[in-house]
Interface confidence: low
Amino acid sequence: MALNSGSPPGIGPCYENHGYQSEHICPPRPPVAPNGYNLYPAQYYPSPVPQYAPRITTQASTSVIHTHPKSSGALCTSKSKKSLCLALALGTVLTGAAVAAVLLWRFWDSNCSTSEMECGSSGTCISSSLWCDGVAHCPNGEDENRCVRLYGQSFILQVYSSQRKAWYPVCQDDWSESYGRAACKDMGYKNNFYSSQGIPDQSGATSFMKLNVSSGNVDLYKKLYHSDSCSSRMVVSLRCIECGVRSVKRQSR
Amino acid sequence: IVGGLNASPGDWPWQVSLHVQGVHVCGGSIITPEWIVTAAHCVEEPLSSPRYWTAFAGILRQSLMFYGSRHQVEKVISHPNYDSKTKNNDIALMKLQTPLAFNDLVKPVCLPNPGMMLDLDQECWISGWGATYEKGKTSDVLNAAMVPLIEPSKCNSKYIYNNLITPAMICAGFLQGSVDSCQGDSGGPLVTLKNGIWWLIGDTSWGSGCAKALRPGVYGNVTVFTDWIYQQMRANS
């Protein structure tokens, strides 16, 4: 099997674990069912539904795979929890009753066309060009609060351009820590901010989002405009929280 | 965790133990001082109410858990598209009533960013207080083990999970068995080290038995959910 067929030279066998970006560093492999790791968040894609019974021991030589959720069954050991366990057990039995001998697949189609975006789980569709355009169109305003993101393992700050319907890195020119704090807040980090720094752009980006410092006191991404140049040739690397680090173990001598 | 090793203090500082009425039920991962990622199937009815849940951080042994950092849960947010039959979109968030104080033993893990490159057999780690063998009891001590990712096309082959794996799931483990997450590990982390940083790639979800040949562990594909996680953090701050 040629694992390496989709990889650029020097990267080796790899796949991009897609969240919701549409850029491919490793081009997608031929589709399988389901198609690898999807480009969109869970609420955006069809959901195949096989029928099976959780928490039933696998019987050898059967074609139905019985699966076990990996939460603890210890809850049912205490006598004071009998009613809770009864409810849990009843749920399991009812689920078990739904087992079909053959796995049944059903595909739900997204309501939205390819030129539209879905408003979270509400099912409303809006044109991609209205996404992050400064006006809320979704019932819960999702189209205006998912306009910044961090990209890749270097935490590159990217902003969505509604005109170009694509994500672009933010140029370091005129950037300051206060904007970093605002971006973190936009993402959902209430009181968290760790670091904001310029790092050399290694993606070979030819387009950027730049700060218009003269714009008034408006939302961060409304201060940003599309530009084909970035004089510092540095992009913003933003970390909202110091995460993913373990303490260095100090050996006693 | 089947086939794992006992964890040392500070090894997995984002790991929390989620208790119901004094009993460990699921694991979870710290992502901010107030937010824990866990599995949606952990908080299904009748356990959907936050009042049932307490989170413990910074302690390795269940028998010593009450000496640890103890936090009541304020909100439980299950993924709106979670399917209890298929375990699709098996992710949930817990907001704590009081923020965690970070130290050497209590720290957050990084949420994965879109565009991260993972090797086809990227080495990942699982951790938890789950059973150390199939149908076993919860472990007193936190265990951890290395498991490689299994590419979705392979995991969906008819010899393994025969198309049960959706894009919202990620498989990890050894196809011959022997190392796996197990009952009681649910909701806990599947992490990988990249660029010197530990990333939350998955949340422990399901599997057919534990550590069986051709039945690797299945995890919620956290990369797919980062957008939803940020949305919830924004909406509930």
Epitope: S61, I65 | E123, Y159, Q176
Partner: antibody, heavy 121, light 111 residues
Framework: QVQLQQPGAELAKPGASVKLSCKAS????????MHWVKQRPGQGLEWIGL????????NYNEKFKSKATLTVDKSSRTAYMQLSSLTSEDSAVYYC??????????????WGTGTTVTVSS | DIVLTQSPASLAVSLGQRATISCRAS??????????MHWYQQKPGQPPKLLIY???NLESGVPVRFSGSGSGTDFTLNIHPVEEEDAATYYC?????????FGAGTKLELK
């Protein structure tokens, strides 16, 4: 070609320890799990344990948990098994064998040449 | 652990005849269309050699006179026609789960 090379014999005293080696060549060392199997004279085969060379987190047959310790050195492509607190019961031929976890079928397609351990005072 | 019972413990067969060795598992070693049973040949002073994998698949380089069959709990190794070089001990082994276990072995002698 694919080979697992083991020393022919090891002599040890009761109560002592012995460390057996198994040097792999001709294939990607980290792509296969290494297993160890015991065979007493005139007896059958007994599985001791396994070690995935890329992680080092070994798995043991319950019977050998306090007897054997498995390790690997990726740089020299060598797997090791240390046997401790030796008794005459440990006198046997010990084989390393590779198991392709990628194919997942779990058969031993290549065996080491075997090391004869003799425990004698 | 899954226990494998081999029979007979030994058998003597004339050149050119058929040798049949049986292996019974204490529980099924078949799942998802595969039977995780394998057969090895061992000659004195040598390591075991893989003959048959997944119940019926001939390992490359092994003569076609060796064949395997069975599923679930009952498996058979056939050698036909038996040749002089086939005098050896034969073991079955399962890999359905850990620990993998071996049968006690069947010693094949030539009459």
């Amino acid at each position: 070609q694919v080979q697992l090379q083991q020393p022919g014999a090891e002599l040890a005293k009761p109560g002592a320890s012995v460390k057996l080696s198994c040097k792999a060549s001709g294939y990607t060392f980290t792509s296969y799990w290494m297993h160890w199997v015991k065979q007493r004279p005139g007896q059958g085969l007994e599985w001791i344990g396994l070690i995935p060379p890329n992680s080092g987190s070994s798995n043991y047959n319950e019977k050998f948990k306090s007897k054997a310790t498995l390790t690997v050195d990726k740089s020299s492509r060598t797997a090791y098994m240390q046997l401790s607190s030796l008794t005459s019961e440990d006198s046997a031929v010990y084989y390393c064998a590779r198991w392709d976890y990628g194919s997942s079928y779990g058969y031993f397609d290549v065996w080491g040449t075997g090391t004869t351990v003799t425990v004698s005072s | 652990d899954i226990v494998l019972t081999q029979s007979p413990a030994s058998l003597a067969v004339s050149l050119g005849q058929r040798a049949t060795i049986s292996c019974r598992a204490s529980e099924s070693v078949s799942t998802s269309g595969y039977s995780y049973m394998h057969w090895y040949q061992q000659k004195p002073g040598q390591p075991p050699k893989l003959l048959i994998y997944l119940a019926s698949n001939l390992e490359s380089g092994v003569p076609v006179r060796f064949s395997g069959s069975g599923s679930g709990t009952d498996f058979t190794l056939n050698i036909h026609p038996v040749e002089e070089e086939d005098a050896a001990t034969y073991y079955c082994q399962h890999s359905r789960e850990l620990p993998p276990t071996f049968g006690a072995g069947t010693k094949l002698e030539l009459k």
